[in-house]
């Protein structure tokens, strides 16, 4: 039937033309929509780690490219910490003493892992190389 009518070719052409691609660069976006759900089930990469590697950040050296946690909770809070002297304070108004140690306020970010990603390699713990 396909040989005689070329119906698949014609239908596919009509579908693709309905997207009104302005240039060849728009076409891969359609492929992304089709393939992304499937690739996400195979492996997910950590974009932050990729960015750190690109920026030559030392922190990225021992981090895995494979994304493990997809749902996290970040809590920003202030804690009191000791400093060697008042010169090390974040600001004079945020500095005090108890006669023994000098203290200041410091902003701290706590990251809590909530849910793991749903892909094949999430529990493999394989080296990136």
């Amino acid at each position: 039937v396909e040989v005689a009518t070329h119906y698949l070719e014609i239908i596919t052409q009509l579908i693709v033309e309905s997207f009104h691609f302005k240039n060849g660069e728009d076409a891969p976006d359609l492929l992304k929509v089709i393939t992304k759900p499937f690739t996400k089930l195979i492996v997910q990469l950590d974009k932050k780690v990729i960015s750190q590697i690109a920026m030559n950040d030392e922190k990225a050296k021992n981090k895995s490219l494979v994304k493990i946690w997809c749902k996290t909770f970040t809590n920003k809070t202030q804690i009191n910490v000791t400093v060697p002297s008042t010169a090390n304070c974040t600001s004079p108004s945020l500095c005090w003493t108890d006669g023994i140690q000098n203290w200041t306020m410091k902003n701290v970010t706590y990251k809590e892992n909530i849910a793991k990603c749903q892909h094949i390699f999430v529990n493999f713990h394989l080296p990136d190389l």
């Epitope: 009191n80 005090w96 003493t97 108890d98 023994i100 000098n102």
Partner: antibody
């Protein structure tokens, strides 16, 4: 409420080591919020801070006594102790164990809780 | 070491009197100053912390003021139980006490 109780010998011979223990009830000495310290008062005289111990076992001493003082803690018994070596008659005093807030939890510090004190006499 | 000098060393007053005790620091200690009351044979008790804050349970006739190097403890109307020795103490750099002020009945 937090209570402090000193215990130790009332008489120590010159050149020996004075040892006193303070038992804390109603609160934990493992708290980041407080220092636990020692103050002495010779008969008819004023008060002198000897030293204090803080969370994690960090110790702080009065510079004038530093070479002779050791303060330690036993968190399992909720006790902290004072050792003062090479004592002389000048070390005869009432010894108080005290609590004072650390800057971790507040922006002021004062000796807010005191033990009743124990009189230690240095004499042969 | 920060030295605290109290004045007077002793004073006599009567019940109902207004009494002021001063404490001078050898260098500026901001508001890091505390006041204690000690009765014979007893441990000292905290009255005022941070120069002017009244410790919980302390009668309101006690008040503190000052900043920097000069501080005062005021008893607005002396009561019989107020006759005792008073000490100032700084927590700005290490922990030191004043020599004490003995308050006696006139």
């Amino acid at each position: 409420q937090v209570q402090l109780q000193e215990s130790g010998p009332e008489l120590v011979k010159p050149s020996e080591t004075l040892s006193i223990t303070c038992t804390v009830s109603g609160g934990s000495i493992s708290s980041r919020s407080y220092y636990w310290g020692w103050i002495r008062q010779p008969p008819g005289k004023g008060l002198e801070w000897i030293g204090s111990i803080y969370y994690g076992g960090s110790t702080y001493y009065n510079p004038s006594l530093k070479s002779r003082v050791t303060i330690s803690a036993d968190t399992s018994k909720n006790q902290f102790s004072l050792k003062l070596n090479s004592v002389t008659a000048a070390d005869t005093a009432v010894f108080y164990c005290v609590r004072h807030p650390a800057g971790y939890s507040t922006r002021w510090s004062a000796f807010d809780i005191w033990g009743q004190g124990t009189m230690v006499t240095v004499s042969s | 070491e920060i030295v605290l000098t109290q004045s007077p060393s002793s004073l006599s007053a009567s019940v109902g009197d207004r009494v002021t005790i001063t404490c001078r620091a050898s260098q500026s200690i901001s508001s890091y100053l505390n006041w204690y009351q000690q009765k014979p044979g007893r441990a000292p008790e905290l009255l005022i912390y941070a120069a002017s804050s009244l410790q919980s349970g302390v009668p309101s006739r006690f008040s503190g003021s000052g900043s920097g190097t000069d501080f005062t403890l005021t008893i607005s109307s002396l009561q019989p139980e107020d006759f005792a020795t008073y000490y100032c103490q700084q927590s700005f750099s290490s922990l030191t006490f004043g020599q004490g002020t003995r308050l006696e009945i006139k």
